[in-house]
Amino acid sequence: MAVTACQGLGFVVSLIGIAGIIAATCMDQWSTQDLYNNPVTAVFNYQGLWRSCVRESSGFTECRGYFTLLGLPAMLQAVRALMIVGIVLGAIGLLVSIFALKCIRIGSMEDSAKANMTLTSGIMFIVSGLCAIAGVSVFANMLVTNFWMSTANMYTGMGGMVQTVQTRYTFGAALFVGWVAGGLTLIGGVMMCIACRGLAPEETNYKAVSYHASGHSVAYKPGGFKASTGFGSNTKNKKIYDGGARTEDEVQSYPSKHDYV
């Protein structure tokens, strides 16, 4: 039950996180005009990964896409790449994790397969979250660097007076969305990995085997030996992964694979 809950919660948290990463990637407000020097500006600038926008005094907002690919800063390209990789990995992770969910039965999928899929999706979510956090952090670092550079430039020129004040940019809403979303995806991935450990059946349960001692008709039913008992053939002491019927003894040994939440 706890495993199913952990897996389900991990999936939901990751789903929210990936939706947030997609939202952050599409948002225009990665950087917004710093209003410290001009709080009464009638023209407000903000920029995203794909376009820059200007809101004018009329209330009209004009956005223009970055139609060049080669002319863009390498850092911006890197951020775009990180965010896209994060989204792709997250989307694949979501797809894999849907089939890995314990509460969903698909044919006669073995628990080991579900465990492997859960682990795979968990790792994908972790990498996806890290990509998003890295992308947002690289962009934030770029902003901080540019902010202080433009601050230094602001007070240079003829007698310390400049007529054209350089527009400075600060953190936009998308950065915070990205950080939170990346964190959620990361947490979701960790939860999936934890759930994977609980999903993998432990090597403690075997099908009941009858051993016939020579000359006697005494049946031994060793229920749950981990190591060979030293008598009889050990080749039959195999852990079962099939979803088939179980003996009475085995039913007592560990919870059913088909627990539903």
């Epitope: 023209v43 820059s52 200007v54 009329s58």
Partner: antibody, heavy 115, light 113 residues
Amino acid sequence: QVQLVQSGAEVKKPGASVKVSCKASGYTFTDYNMHWVRQAPGQRLEWIGYINPNNGGTSYNQKFKGRVTITVDTSASTAYMELSSLRSEDTAVYYCVTTRYLAVWGQGTTVTVSS
Amino acid sequence: DIVMTQSPSSLSVSVGDRVTMTCKSSQSLFNSGNQKNYLTWYQQKPGKAPKLLIYWASTRESGVPDRFSGSGSGTDFTLTISSVQPEDFATYFCQNDYSYPLTFGGGTKLEIK
């Protein structure tokens, strides 16, 4: 076509208040901010403030702060500008202005403040 | 507040003349975000509301004759009428559309010589 129709001329006593209306048509009212500008006789145009019809957010010229209130009735596509504590120097033609680049102006409302 | 200074305050010209009027702002009206200068020119005739002529310092509003042209950047701007027509005799205002409060120049009155 885009049109702004303002209310008629007003004559007020000093200390009184005036409320000028501006009915918009020919465009989506909430798409653009509504600005108010006045022009006193022989004076340059003077910006009073604006309202964002989407959220009711306003920004006023410090000169008029505390005396001016701009409101909107989005259902009627109408903006209002109320100026209180009127004085003789408030005698002017008041205009509402909207659309991109502040291209569309109302016909103007003459407010005369006289004792 | 940004102070807008227009010169001359009045101009006496004949029909067909080329006219240039200037507008200076106390601060730059250039927006680096979209590389535009937020200066607007209006024409006003007596008893009428101002009419938009030029926005972004040099972009003509639709329907405005091409004899009107705007130029300049930063703090210095000009409005030129290549060949004055009888209907052009009016007062011309420049406006700061970059920073609140939005401010207007004192105007240049174009009169018939």
